[in-house]
């Protein structure tokens, strides 16, 4: 029950996170005009990953797309790439996790397969969240650098009297949405990975070992461990039966209806 709850919650948290990453990527307010200590203007500038906008006090808003690829800063391109990779991985992760949900039955899919899928989606969510956090952080760093550069030469005097006010940009709402969304996706991914450990079936069931050796019965040593999911480090562990009937490396098996005699 706890595993199902953890998996379900992980899925929901990741879903919200990925929706947030998509929203942040599409938002225009990645950077907004810094109003502090600036002359009050009737025009407010803000910029996104895909276009820049100008909102006038009259309410009129005009947005212009960046219709060039080569002319854009490499950092902006990198941020775009990170966000898109985050969205793609997150979307794939969501698809995988839907099929991995314990509460959803698909054919005769075994718990081991669901465990694998849960871990796969969990890792995808973690990477997706990290991509979003990295993208937003790179953009934020770019803003901070530009902010202090423009502050250093904010007023460039022209003949003493005439001044040009340099527009400074500060953090926009999209950055905070991106950070929170990336964090949620990351948390959701971790929850999925935790759920995966619970989903993987315990191999503590007594397996039938049917053979004769030296005319006396073979004692079964318990001390089993969780079934390998294919992603763990326990694939090389061997569960040795007295008499050396078989190892998990030779025949990796999970409890099924045929295991019980």
């Amino acid at each position: 029950m706890a595993v199902t709850a953890c998996q379900g919650l992980g899925f929901v948290v990741s879903l919200i996170g990925i929706a947030g990453i998509i929203a942040a990527t599409c938002m225009d307010q990645w950077s907004t005009q810094d109003l502090y200590n600036n002359p009050v203007t009737a025009v407010f500038n803000y910029q996104g990953l895909w276009r820049s906008c100008v909102r006038e006090s009259s309410g009129f808003t005009e947005c212009r797309g960046y219709f060039t690829l080569l002319g854009l800063p490499a950092m902006l391109q990198a941020v775009r790439a990170l966000m898109i990779v985050g969205i793609v991985l997150g979307a794939i992760g969501l698809l995988v996790s839907i099929f991995a949900l314990k509460c959803i039955r698909i054919g005769s899919m075994e718990d081991s397969a669901k465990a694998n899928m849960t871990l796969t989606s969990g890792i995808m969510f973690i990477v997706s969240g990290l991509c979003a956090i990295a993208g937003v952080s790179v953009f934020a760093n770019m803003l901070v650098t530009n902010f202090w550069m423009s502050t250093a030469n904010m007023y460039t005097g022209m003949g003493g009297m005439v001044q040009t006010v340099q527009t400074r940009y500060t953090f926009g709402a999209a950055l905070f949405v991106g950070w929170v969304a990336g964090g949620l996706t990351l948390i959701g991914g971790v929850m999925m990975c935790i759920a995966c450990r619970g989903l993987a079936p315990e191999e503590t069931n007594y397996k039938a070992v049917s053979y004769h050796a030296s005319g006396h019965s073979v004692a079964y040593k318990p001390g089993g461990f969780k079934a390998s999911t294919g992603f763990g480090s326990n694939t090389k562990n061997k569960k040795i039966y007295d008499g050396g009937a078989r190892t998990e490396d030779e025949v990796q098996s999970y409890p099924s209806k045929h295991d019980y005699v």
């Epitope: 009737a42 025009v43 100008v54 009129f60 005009e62 001044q163 340099q166 527009t167």
Partner: antibody, heavy 118, light 113 residues
Framework: QVQLVESGGGVVQPGRSLRLSCTVS????????VYWVRQAPGKGLEWVAV???????NYNSALKGRFTISKDNSKSTLYLQMNSLRAEDTAVYYC????????????WGQGTLVTVSS | DIVMTQSPDSLAVSLGERATINCKSS????????????LAWYQQKPGQPPKLLIY???TRESGVPDRFSGSGSGTDFTLTISSLQAEDVAVYYC?????????FGQGTKVEIK
Amino acid sequence: QVQLVESGGGVVQPGRSLRLSCTVSGFTLTSYGVYWVRQAPGKGLEWVAVVWAGGNTNYNSALKGRFTISKDNSKSTLYLQMNSLRAEDTAVYYCARDRGRLLAMDYWGQGTLVTVSS
Amino acid sequence: DIVMTQSPDSLAVSLGERATINCKSSQSLLNSGNQKNYLAWYQQKPGQPPKLLIYGASTRESGVPDRFSGSGSGTDFTLTISSLQAEDVAVYYCQNDYFFPFTFGQGTKVEIK
């Protein structure tokens, strides 16, 4: 067609208050910003205040908070409350509509004269 | 506050001749976000309210004759009347539409020589 009609002007003593009105037609105050601009006799234009479509306001800091701009959208009327009037406030007061894009005053009223005199 | 300085204060031009009025602002009126200049030009005839001629430094308001043109960017702007007509006798004002308060120039009186 767009029209702006100012009213409420007249002779007032220094230190007293006066409220000017500007009734608009042909457009709504929820869609356009409206300004008050004044012109002292024989002098140039001086920007007084603006109330934007959304209700935000901006003032000429030189007027030191004596003037207050407001509007009643349902009555399509703009107001300018002028307190602690001085002789230098004597002027023709115009209301003008903001054109929307690139912020310029495209339609003007005929103006109302305010004379501050003892 | 932004100071708008017009030159000359008055201008006498023969009919059909070109009239040029300059306007200088104490700070740039060019917005980096959309590369637009927030400056307007108005014409005021005696006993009348001002009339908008040019906005955005160079865009002519509808109904304004094409002999009126605006140019310039940043801090220096110009209003040109390519061929002065008798009805163009008026006072012309430039206005900062970027920084609050929206200041006007002192005005330039255009007369016929």
